[in-house]
Amino acid sequence: MAVTACQGLGFVVSLIGIAGIIAATCMDQWSTQDLYNNPVTAVFNYQGLWRSCVRESSGFTECRGYFTLLGLPAMLQAVRALMIVGIVLGAIGLLVSIFALKCIRIGSMEDSAKANMTLTSGIMFIVSGLCAIAGVSVFANMLVTNFWMSTANMYTGMGGMVQTVQTRYTFGAALFVGWVAGGLTLIGGVMMCIACRGLAPEETNYKAVSYHASGHSVAYKPGGFKASTGFGSNTKNKKIYDGGARTEDEVQSYPSKHDYV
């Protein structure tokens, strides 16, 4: 029950996180005009990953897309790439985790398969969250670096006169959305990985029959080799040599703390 809850919660948290990453990537307010020294301004500038916008005091806003690839800063391209990779990984992770959910039955899918899928989706969520956090952090670092190196915004005034406005940019709302969303996706991924440990069966239970030897009765236990390698259930030093013949089902197996991760 706890495993199902952990897995379900991990899925929901990751879903919210990925929705947030998508929202942050699409938002225009990655950097906003710093109004600290000039709180009353005729225009308010803000920029996103895909376009830059100007809002007038009337409320009228005009946005312009960055219709170039080669002319854009390499850092901006890197941030775009990180966010897109984060979204893609997160989306695949969500798809995988839907099928991995313990509460959803798909044919005769074994718990081991669900455990593997849960682990896969968990890792994908972790990487997705890290990509988003990295992308937002790179952009934030870029803003901090350029804060004092004011950006010149060109506006053509009336009669062909050119007016240059010195503008400094600070953190926009999208950065905070991205950080929180990345964190949520990361937490969701960790929860999925934790749930995977509880989902993974200790070993496959075969209906094996033990055979009597002429001398000492030796019960053949499938997975005996695994026990000797340290990955099976013999980590608790259970006897695998028994006097009487019995089926494997009669041999009580205890859950091990050494499950698949």
């Epitope: 005729a42 506006y155 053509t156």
Partner: nanobody
Amino acid sequence: EVQLLESGGGLVQPGGSLRLSCAASRSTYCMGWFRQAPGKGLERVANVYMRNGDTWLADSVKGRFTISRDNSKNAVYLQMNSLRAEDTAVYYCAAGRSSCLEASISYWGQGTLVTVSS
């Protein structure tokens, strides 16, 4: 140089309607209307992007005014309904070559007076 020709202003009673027209001598990126009430500053009323038809209206006129365009005539129209006394102003047609922002408006009309009074 683009010439803007405005028409349609006049005296109207409160609650009445007027239709302002503005024709440009050649195509522009954006066209719109600004107004200046007596003793007040210039206020953006509405604008339309000629290429895709996207429109913007000031909150004070939303639901009462509509802006439309006719690309074949390089013209823009402002339909004003339910006019109020506070709508009294000189209405200026404006056009931008590459932007609709006030600072980037390249061309201005002479203005047409709209008076709302009983």
